[in-house]
Structure formats: structure tokens, C-alpha cells
């Protein structure tokens, strides 16, 4: 058993049929010695008396808010949560496996630049009685500070018969140099509590590996005289690290119709303009990627050909 | 510390091309190592990230773009002394800091070159003959060093009398390649920045 926060405790349980469970001793936070009784949740049934209460925690029915009273007055609370371990593996029931970039990916993180700011998100099908708290650091043995905000519900989607909820959090490394060469990874830890179930999820990464620039901005087309070719130009996204001559991007320019199966023109360039063949009913799209360290491409920025 | 000798401005900053080749060569070599040593811990997640130049050179700090010198987090610089007289320097336009930067890059390359050559000598003794360093990568390191053209004492190649542990050598190769790739990215960024200046 360990303390998650004040008056909230996590009991770690090996979860299998007829498991013996864990013996837990609760102590009432009071100078009083006599006349103390214990109840669980909203029930008025007295579970025991005395300053301490010893319980055998085996299942979710044994978890919940234990309250010690004296003469109708509440003295203190202890909330017990369960953390299940099945076949030596901690449960991951609360969050959905996003399977990208590999199986057992529950947390996904992205950074728009090298400033040390990043966003992580996760998915769940649970809509109520759900809380998250997020901690982060650079390195684990001698951790350096990363400050994370509160996790918020950022999107809701319908997936077949199910609703899916996306939560996200923004974090900022306290003293980040965009030009630094990372040797210690960022660690992100998410505590998830659903009703009386506790789970924790972690992710470890270098900012350089989670870079995904914003799409290029200000796409403009200039038809070339006596030709089917069009000069397309764009600018670096505002959120990208500066100076751009140091933090350079490379671009992919594509002309394609509405369907992905349609024919296309595609060209890669380090410049902020390119010449392509425009077709009727097609769109010109441009995306960006760090020129020197190949992490993710940005989403496409698009303009119609006509 | 002597300032760089003035040479005619070569127009296109001559080291940019070499640094692009360097990044390409080390990325290819790292990819080859990951594939060949698939049963060894050779991915970014599996290895310890060590920097053999730590406390010996200060490339990131010495080559910091002017725009980032206002960022206090970027200025925990280590003082290191370098000999400078580089031919990549676009002469009159070159500041003292730029000379220091290129000199630091040169020292990085020299240190990695020695490590890689020592390692290759060990890998050539491996009866499995599983992996060797790409001669192209070693040649590209050499080309960039020649283009930088700094005077510097030669570092003797480390020779080891004891029987090499090939498993450890291959893991060390992965660690070195990962670190060198990160440094090659920095070098490429620096050359691009200097070329644009």
C-alpha cells in the first residue's frame, strides 16, 4: 500500500481467483483514543471500533472511502483504491491501446518545435467517475523539471456503437534550449483513477523524436505563362523554431484529386516554393518535416487548383 | 587563439555539402547497424545515450545561433580552448565565435574518427564478421575534416592488448553511432545557418 495523495491510498493486488489479497491497517487521524467507529462509503454498518482498523483487501467491494467517527462526528477519511496485477502485468483497463506507433501505446505525445513544450493525449471509452493526474521530468535518476497542466477532455468521437473520449495535457520543460542535444529522455507519468480502480501509464521519449511541425502557412499559387505548370509558394509555420536557417524544414508538395486513388504529381523540396502540374478539380497540398532529423511529417496545408 | 587566415569567399559555404554527406553516411550506417544487429540492444530506446565529446568540446554552445544566445538555458557553456585556422571560414565575414565553433566541430570529428577506427580494428577480428564500419562514412568524416582544415595534434589510435569482447564492441558501436548521428544533425544545422548568414 502507498499514498497517492493526502488520504488516498493505493493497494496493489495480485489478481487471480481465490487470491489472499492484502492486509491493510488504517489509522484514524485523531488524538482521540476511545469511542471510535469505522464505516465504508455511505453505509452506516459499523466495520470495527478503535483507533486502527485491520481489513483484508481482496476485491473492489473492499475498496472505497473508509471513515472513522466519534459520536456522530467525522474524524478522518481514507480512500482505498485498487491497482490490479494479473500474471505479473499491471492492468490497463482504463485507457485504450492506440497501437501507433506500436502495440501497447496508451500515451501519445507530439511537439510542434524544439522549445521543450509538448502535448500528450490518450483515449478512453469511460465517460464518468474518471480523473487523471500527470507528472513529467527529464530523466528519472536525477530528474530535471517539466511542468504539466491539468488534463482536459479535448475531443469526443463516435466509434461504431461506442463513444470515445480523448484527453490531453500540455507540458513545458522548465529550462529548455532548442539547440540542445538530448541525452536523457522526457518521462511522462499519468495516474488514472476510474471509480476505485487505479492505473498508471508511462511514456519515455526525446523531444526530437516526437517533433511534428504545424502545416506550412500562406499557400499561394501563381500560374506560369503558356504552361500547365503552377508555381506554389508557402511559408514556415509560425510555431516552428527559429532561426529557420538553423532549424530548417523540408517539404513535400502534392497535387491530387479528391480520391487517394487518383493520379498525382509529387515533388520534394527544401525551398519554400515549387513548380507542379495543376489539374482541374485537384488540390495542391504541402507538408513539412524537419530537414535533418526525420520525425513526423506535418498535416497537409491545401489550396484548390482552380 | 589565432583568428582564421583570410581566404577568398568561396560563395557557397564549402562545408555545407560535406556536412550533408556526413549526416547521410552516419544515418545509413546506423540503419545498417540496427538491421544487422537486430538481436542486440541497438535502438534509441534500448541504448544508453553517451557523448564521447562531453567536457572535451562544446559544439552546441560554441555554435549557438545568435538568436538563441539570449536564451539562458542555452548558455551553460563549458570553456574549452581550440586552435583555429580553418579553410571553411568565409574569411573576412568570420567572427571569432565562428572560428571557435568550426574548431569545436573539427575536434568532434577527430574524436569520433579515432573511436571508429579503433572499433573497426576490433570488428575486423570478429570471427562472425557480422558488421564493419562503412568506409564511405570514414571517408566523409575525413573530407569534412580536410575542408575544415584546422591544425591540431593527432590523437594516437587506441590499441588494446586484451582480447576484444565482440558483444560489448557491437553495443558500443550502436551507442557511438546514435551519438554521432545527433552530433551530425547539429553540425548540419550549424553549416546551414552559417551558409545563410
Amino acid at each position: 500500500i502507498w499514498e497517492l495523495k493526502k488520504d488516498v491510498y493505493v493497494v496493489e493486488l495480485d489478481w487471480y481467483p481465490d487470491a489472499p489479497g492484502e492486509m491493510v491497517v488504517l489509522t484514524c487521524d485523531t488524538p482521540e483514543e476511545d469511542g471510535i467507529t469505522w464505516t465504508l462509503d455511505q453505509s452506516s454498518e459499523v466495520l470495527g471500533s478503535g483507533k486502527t482498523l485491520t481489513i483484508q483487501v481482496k476485491e473492489f467491494g473492499d475498496a472505497g472511502q473508509y471513515t472513522c467517527h466519534k459520536g456522530g462526528e467525522v474524524l478522518s477519511h481514507s480512500l482505498l483504491l485498487l491497482h490490479k496485477k494479473e500474471d505479473g502485468i499491471w492492468s490497463t483497463d482504463i485507457l485504450k491501446d492506440q497501437k501507433e506507433p506500436k502495440n501497447k501505446t496508451f500515451l501519445r505525445c507530439e511537439a510542434k518545435n524544439y522549445s521543450g513544450r509538448f502535448t500528450c493525449w490518450w483515449l478512453t471509452t469511460i465517460s464518468t467517475d474518471l480523473t487523471f493526474s500527470v507528472k513529467s521530468s527529464r530523466g528519472s535518476s536525477d530528474p530535471q523539471g517539466v511542468t504539466c497542466g491539468a488534463a482536459t477532455l479535448s475531443a469526443e468521437r463516435v466509434r461504431g456503437d461506442n463513444k470515445e473520449y480523448e484527453y490531453s495535457v500540455e507540458c513545458q520543460e522548465d529550462s529548455a534550449c532548442p539547440a540542445a542535444e538530448e541525452s536523457l529522455p522526457i518521462e511522462v507519468m499519468v495516474d488514472a483513477v476510474h471509480k476505485l480502480k487505479y492505473e498508471n501509464y508511462t511514456s519515455s521519449f526525446f523531444i526530437r523524436d516526437i517533433i511534428k511541425p504545424d502545416p506550412p502557412k500562406n499557400l499561394q499559387l501563381k500560374p506560369l505563362k503558356n504552361s500547365r505548370q503552377v508555381e506554389v509558394s508557402w511559408e514556415y509555420p509560425d510555431t516552428w523554431s527559429t532561426p529557420h536557417s538553423y532549424f530548417s524544414l523540408t517539404f513535400c508538395v502534392q497535387v491530387q484529386g479528391k480520391s487517394k486513388r487518383e493520379k498525382k504529381d509529387r515533388v520534394f523540396t527544401d525551398k519554400t516554393s515549387a513548380t507542379v502540374i495543376c489539374r482541374k478539380n485537384a488540390s495542391i497540398s504541402v507538408r513539412a518535416q524537419d530537414r535533418y532529423y526525420s520525425s513526423s511529417w506535418s498535416e497537409w496545408a491545401s489550396v484548390p487548383c482552380s | 587563439r589565432n583568428l582564421p587566415v583570410a581566404t577568398p569567399d568561396p560563395g557557397m559555404f564549402p562545408c555545407l555539402h560535406h556536412s550533408q554527406n556526413l549526416l547521410r553516411a552516419v544515418s545509413n550506417m546506423l540503419q545498417k547497424a540496427r538491421q544487422t544487429l537486430e538481436f542486440y540492444p541497438c535502438t534509441s530506446e534500448e541504448i544508453d545515450h553517451e557523448d564521447i565529446t562531453k567536457d572535451k568540446t562544446s559544439t552546441v554552445e560554441a555554435c549557438l545561433p545568435l538568436e538563441l544566445t539570449k536564451n539562458e538555458s542555452c548558455l551553460n557553456s563549458r570553456e574549452t580552448s581550440f586552435i583555429t585556422n580553418g579553410s571553411c571560414l568565409a574569411s573576412r565575414k568570420t567572427s571569432f565565435m565562428m572560428a571557435l565553433c568550426l574548431s569545436s566541430i573539427y575536434e568532434d570529428l577527430k574524436m569520433y574518427q579515432v573511436e571508429f577506427k579503433t572499433m573497426n580494428a576490433k570488428l575486423l577480428m570478429d570471427p562472425k564478421r557480422q558488421i564493419f564500419l562503412d568506409q564511405n562514412m570514414l571517408a566523409v568524416i575525413d573530407e569534412l575534416m580536410q575542408a575544415l582544415n584546422f591544425n591540431s595534434e593527432t590523437v594516437p589510435q587506441k590499441s588494446s592488448l586484451e582480447e576484444p569482447d565482440f558483444y560489448k564492441t557491437k553495443i558500443k558501436l550502436c551507442i557511438l553511432l546514435h551519438a554521432f548521428r545527433i552530433r551530425a544533425v547539429t553540425i548540419d544545422r550549424v553549416m546551414s545557418y552559417l551558409n545563410a548568414s
Epitope: R228, Q229, T250, R261, E262, K263, K264, D265, R266, V267, F268, T269, D270, T275, I277, R279, K280 | -
Partner: antibody
Framework: EVQLVQSGAEVKKPGATVKISCKAS????????LHWVRQRPGKGLEWMGW????????EYAPKFQGRVTITADTSTDTGYLELSSLRSEDTAVYYC???????????WGQGTLVTVSS | DIQMTQSPSSVSASVGDRVTITCRAS??????LHWYQQKPGKAPKLLIK???QSISGVPSRFSGSGSGTDFSLTINSLQPEDFATYYC?????????FGGGTKVEIK
């Protein structure tokens, strides 16, 4: 299976015009760009131009501009290359090539040898 | 027009050898570079697109690298069916242009 089958060999006199065909099968003809590339004996490859069969848009290499015409007939799924004012240096194998992407060549015809000789 | 220069023009090698062919563009073409294999009397066949992207059905011993002006095609362990002529082609701008070819011959 995506396939391009070209017409047979041709022998032409200098100054004449040649028209060779390229019949597509195994895909929707207008879904791919069609290119023509030639190869002179013992020499390398030379791109001549492309057509978008969907709308008839064409683009030619400056070297051949004015002498070459590329057309496409969507009713027969066939592309054509017409080269006029032939000279001996036009003796070559002419290939049609197709792709959904405009700028490289995924599927090739077997080639048509055109000999220009007096 | 962008000129593409291949080297060497021919190379003699044995089965099992590692062969590298290079291609240089007269100006920067990013990764807009493709490789083809051609056997005598046959049409070319696409091996690699956009400098390093593999083509389905092409053996994994063929790999490409490069960007900007310098590119290379590597055949990792040469097989008897790999003796052929190899061409690079730039797609950065029209007109599309090819390298002069590299003939890989049996030693």
C-alpha cells in the same frame, strides 16, 4: 495485371513521320499518366513527354517540341506518339511508360524500334 | 535542364559482391531521384523511388540513399540476375532527365 503493349517495328525515310501506339490493359486508362521515352542504340534513356489521358493535357521535352505529338484515345485505351521530320539520329527504341505519379515510370511497354534510313 | 552524371560508367563485380553506383545532379534536387534496372533487349524496371523508397517486388538487397546533389544505389550481395545497366532519373523539374547509365558486368 497492368500492361502496356506497343505496336511493331517501323522503318522510315528521313523527313517522314512515324506514329506508334501503346495499348493499355489491366487498369483504367485515364487513371494513369502516359509517357514516352526513347533509347538510341547503345545509348541512355531520353524522356520525350507525357499526356494525361483524362483531359488530353500534354507536356513535351524542349528538345522535341514542335516535332512530337502525344495523343490518347480513351475509347480504345491506347496512347500514340507521332514524331515528324525524322532524321537518322531518331533511330531508337521508343518506350511508352505509365504511372499514377507524374514524374517517374512504374510500368513500361516492351518498346518499338524505329529505324530511320534512306 | 538538370544534368545527371552517373559513375562509374561500368563496373566489374562478382556474385556476392557489394556494388555501389553514384549519381550526381547538376543542381540540388532534394530526394526527387529514381533508379531503374535495364537488361539487354528489355524495358527498364523501377527499383527505387524518391532516393530511398523501396518498390514492392524489388529484392531488399537494392537500396538507395542521398539527397541534394549526391545519390547512390547499393546492391548488397550481387546476384547473377543483377548484371544489367542501371539508370538514375531526376523528377525535380521538367524536362525529366536520366543519367548516362552504369553497366554492371561479370568480373
Amino acid at each position: 495485371e497492368v500492361q502496356l503493349v506497343q505496336s511493331g517495328a517501323e522503318v522510315k525515310k528521313p523527313g517522314a513521320t512515324v506514329k506508334i501506339s501503346c495499348k493499355a490493359s489491366g487498369y483504367t486508362f485515364s487513371d494513369y499518366y502516359l509517357h514516352w521515352v526513347r533509347q538510341r542504340p547503345g545509348k541512355g534513356l531520353e524522356w520525350m513527354g507525357w499526356i494525361d489521358p483524362e483531359n488530353g493535357d500534354t507536356e513535351y521535352a524542349p528538345k522535341f517540341q514542335g516535332r512530337v505529338t502525344i495523343t490518347a484515345d480513351t475509347s480504345t485505351d491506347t496512347g500514340y506518339l507521332e514524331l515528324s521530320s525524322l532524321r537518322s539520329e531518331d533511330t531508337a527504341v521508343y518506350y511508352c511508360a505509365a504511372n499514377k505519379e507524374l514524374r517517374y515510370f512504374d510500368v513500361w511497354g516492351q518498346g518499338t524500334l524505329v529505324t530511320v534510313s534512306s | 535542364d538538370i544534368q545527371m552524371t552517373q559513375s562509374p560508367s561500368s563496373v566489374s563485380a562478382s556474385v556476392g559482391d557489394r556494388v555501389t553506383i553514384t549519381c550526381r545532379a547538376s543542381q540540388s534536387i532534394s530526394i526527387n531521384l529514381h533508379w531503374y534496372q535495364q537488361k539487354p533487349g528489355k524495358a527498364p524496371k523501377l527499383l527505387i523511388k524518391f532516393a530511398s523508397q523501396s518498390i514492392s517486388g524489388v529484392p531488399s538487397r537494392f537500396s538507395g540513399s542521398g539527397s541534394g546533389t549526391d545519390f547512390s544505389l547499393t546492391i548488397n550481395s550481387l546476384q547473377p540476375e543483377d548484371f544489367a545497366t542501371y539508370y538514375c532519373q531526376q523528377s525535380n523539374s521538367f524536362p525529366l532527365t536520366f543519367g548516362g547509365g552504369t553497366k554492371v558486368e561479370i568480373k
